[in-house]
């Protein structure tokens, strides 16, 4: 718990505690903002972002945004508060340990976004979840 000599400010979002009063450590995320990418037509890609940052607020999670238009492909890596929309979309998968890309509707481009909550989880962005047990082919292998 927070020791008595560490003041807890009122309405302060820099100190986040769980139900037991334990302080939440902030997330460590890849944080290169928007960069050009060569990631295309692959089941998964590495971010190629060399910057790992401490997220400013402990409630923030890691986010990756992959965009493709007629001119280029970009990959964005950031920290973001899942209570707030990002690029006008809610971070539905913020509790996931992996960054599983989901396509979003954006006019004039192909737009995928993922969020996750384990250290540097937005370094490995996954477009096809290989080990998803809802995959019938995988179930067939398991039960053979």
């Amino acid at each position: 718990t927070i020791p008595p000599h560490v003041q807890k400010s009122v309405n302060n979002d820099m100190i986040v505690t769980d139900n037991n009063g334990a302080v939440k450590f902030p997330q460590l995320c890849k944080f290169c903002d928007v960069r050009f990418s060569t990631c295309d037509n692959q089941k998964s890609c590495m971010s190629n972002c060399s910057i790992t940052s401490i997220c400013e607020k402990p409630q923030e999670v890691c986010v990756a945004v992959w965009r493709k238009n007629d001119e280029n492909i970009t990959l964005e890596t950031v920290c973001h508060d899942p209570k707030l929309p990002y690029h006008d979309f809610i971070l539905e998968d913020a509790a996931s340990p992996k960054c599983i890309m989901k396509e979003k509707k954006k006019p004039g481009e192909t737009f995928f976004m993922c969020s996750c909550s384990s250290d540097e989880c937005n370094d490995n962005i996954i477009f096809s979840e290989e080990y998803n047990t809802s995959n019938p082919d995988l179930l067939l292998v398991i039960f053979q």
Epitope: A22, F25, Q27, S118, D119
Partner: nanobody, 124 residues
């Protein structure tokens, strides 16, 4: 049980440097990811920097990147923070804290053994 004791704070002019130390007693220091955390007057906690126990990989908040350097000496059970190009906004009480290992570094462990902190004042 790991006890932490910070030292090295003081009054420094803008642009100056300080080196903080955090001495840990206890034999488990080498198991923990260690953090420097600060609290400015009337503000909340700010997570400044972290360092892994093995390999000593380091992480920084954007506000201190390029100015502060975290390091540790596991043989001396000591954590350090070298602070250069100090600014008025770096004025705070600095604490070291340990993050207990969990599954991929649990994010909700108690910061159970805090030191009393060391005050850094940046002023001309």
């Amino acid at each position: 049980e790991v006890q932490l004791l910070e030292s090295g704070g003081g009054l420094v002019q803008p642009g100056g440097s300080l080196r903080l130390s955090c001495a840990a007693s206890g034999s488990t220091f080498t198991e923990y990811r260690m953090w420097w955390v600060r609290q400015a007057p009337g503000k909340g906690l700010e997570w400044v920097s972290a360092i892994e126990p093995i390999g000593h990989r380091t992480y920084y908040a954007n506000s201190v990147k390029g100015r502060f350097t975290i390091s540790r000496d596991n043989s001396k059970n000591t954590l350090y923070l070298q602070m250069n190009s100090l600014r008025a906004e770096d004025t705070a009480v600095y604490y070291c804290a340990k993050q207990a290992p969990g599954e991929k570094w649990a994010r909700r462990w108690d910061l159970d053994y805090w030191g009393q902190g060391t005050l850094v004042t940046v002023s001309s």
